[in-house]
């Protein structure tokens, strides 16, 4: 049994890091493998993660961690029974993938303005809480070409757009994702999408 693609990990910078790797053949990850992780810190304890299958030869492990700080560094050992297959390290602050925003809501009752709001996925005491910026994706279910991205570079988890920038009388969907420049993170996954019917009063033509 050999490791074909070494584990790569990303952290949500809160409580979970996710590591993925590939073996050289079909593997029952949960029965055959264990991923050990230990914070390189005074008197830390070692922990065992039981991986799940992620495709035939792929494995994924969700490492539970205490509140992460930028200096944290973990040793990682991949074991098959009593055989050490791979040894590495992981610094969560250097591989951050934020949690996806949640509770995306489209408010359509504000005159002819669409107000999109969502929840910051972090609690206020987490460093990322005040460092997230967002991208909102809006698209038409009827017209694949009607696809747009709005970058939200301020901290407030909301976006206002004129309803008239979208076509009237058709259904749209929106989703939102987050990233943090301070840690040069990757983008989060997209939030679940929400759907609404866009309708607004056309302005009277002036003669």
């Amino acid at each position: 049994m050999k490791v074909l693609q070494e584990p790569t990990c990303v952290s949500d910078y809160m409580s979970i890091s996710t590591c993925e790797w590939k073996m050289n053949g079909p593997t029952n990850c949960s029965t055959e493998l264990r991923l050990l992780y230990q914070l390189v810190f005074l008197l830390s304890e070692a922990h065992t993660c039981i991986p799940e299958n992620n495709g035939g030869a792929g494995c994924v492990c969700h490492l539970l961690m205490d509140d992460v700080v930028s200096a944290d560094n973990y040793t990682l050992d991949l074991w098959a029974g009593q055989q050490l297959l791979w040894k590495g390290s992981f610094k969560p602050s250097e591989h951050v993938k934020p949690r996806a925003p949640g509770n995306l809501t489209v408010h359509t009752n504000v005159s002819d303005t669409l107000l999109l709001t969502w929840s910051n996925p972090y609690p206020p005491d987490n460093y990322l809480y005040n460092h997230l910026t967002y991208a909102v994706n809006i698209w038409s279910e009827n017209d694949p070409a009607d696809f747009r991205i709005y970058n939200v570079t301020y901290l407030e988890p909301s976006l206002r757009i004129a309803a008239s920038t979208l076509k009237s009388g058709i259904s749209y969907r929106a989703r939102v994702r987050a990233w943090a420049q301070c840690y040069n993170t990757t983008w989060s996954e997209w939030s679940p999408s929400t759907k609404w019917h866009n309708s607004y009063r056309e302005p009277f033509e002036q003669h």
């Epitope: 230990q38 005074l42 008197l43 830390s44 304890e45 070692a46 050992d77 074991w79 050490l84």
Partner: antibody, heavy 117, light 107 residues
Framework: EVQLVESGGGLVQPGGSLRLSCAAS????????MSWVRQAPGKGLEWVAI????????YYPDSVKGRFTISRDNAKNSLYLQMNSLRAEDTAVYYC??????????WGQGTTVTVSS | DIQMTQSPSSLSASVGDRVTITCKAS??????LAWYQQKPGKAPKLLIS???SLETGVPSRFSGSGSGRDFTLTISSLQPEDFATYYC?????????FGGGTKVEIK
């Protein structure tokens, strides 16, 4: 070369106090956690106190908690162990040791503490 | 606390002998184990960490093996300076604990 030199051991009566010192050299003292490990006559090794590099975190096993206090002076490259309410079972050679997160990578020669009436 | 049991507690051997010391843990440690050497009246010295990784400057006649609960320290060809007491230590869970020691004496 890493050097750790202990001092302050001696004979003390039960219930008495003693303060051990350890002078460190040959490495950046403030970057390392330090510890005191003891060895009772004819017995094995037991760590009794650990302190982080900055001195902000300390750890003790139940056997000495509330009686022993570890401290450090990074400006003087020195480690200390204040031992109060000493008991006969605290009789041992006390080693100052540098801690590499999980194991002890350099040790001093030790200083003997005898608790007896 | 995790209990570390070393065996034998003492052994007699001659220069050139192959010596094996075992350390058994009360629970699975994977490879979170260190070995130390202590000569009479001297400070302990770290020999091996991670069950198998020799520290810098330690002669290659020393080797560590094992994982899980059972670990071994082997001296392939005993030298006069190797007569000492050897200790194992686990760092899987705090409080980190030591074995009782194995004294290697001259036959």
């Amino acid at each position: 070369e890493v050097q750790l030199v202990e001092s302050g051991g001696g004979l003390v009566q039960p219930g008495g106090s003693l303060r051990l010192s350890c002078a460190a050299s040959g490495f950046t003292f403030s970057s390392y956690a330090m510890s005191w490990v003891r060895q009772a006559p004819g017995k094995g090794l037991e760590w009794v106190a650990i302190i982080s590099g900055g001195g902000d975190s300390t750890y003790y096993p139940d056997s000495v908690k509330g009686r022993f206090t570890i401290s450090r002076d990074n400006a003087k490259n020195s480690l200390y162990l204040q031992m109060n309410s000493l008991r006969a079972e605290d009789t041992a050679v006390y080693y100052c040791a540098r801690l590499h997160y999980w194991y002890f990578d350099f040790w001093g020669q030790g200083t003997t503490v005898t608790v007896s009436s | 606390d995790i209990q570390m049991t070393q065996s034998p507690s003492s052994l007699s051997a001659s220069v050139g002998d192959r010596v094996t010391i075992t350390c058994k843990a009360s629970e699975d440690l994977y490879n979170r184990l260190a070995w130390y050497q202590q000569k009479p009246g001297k400070a302990p010295k770290l020999l091996i960490s991670g069950a198998t990784s020799l520290e810098t400057g330690v002669p290659s006649r020393f080797s560590g093996s094992g994982s899980g609960r059972d670990f071994t320290l082997t001296i392939s060809s005993l030298q006069p300076e190797d007569f000492a007491t050897y200790y194992c230590q686990q760092y899987w869970r705090n409080p980190y604990t030591f074995g009782g020691g194995t004294k290697v004496e001259i036959k």
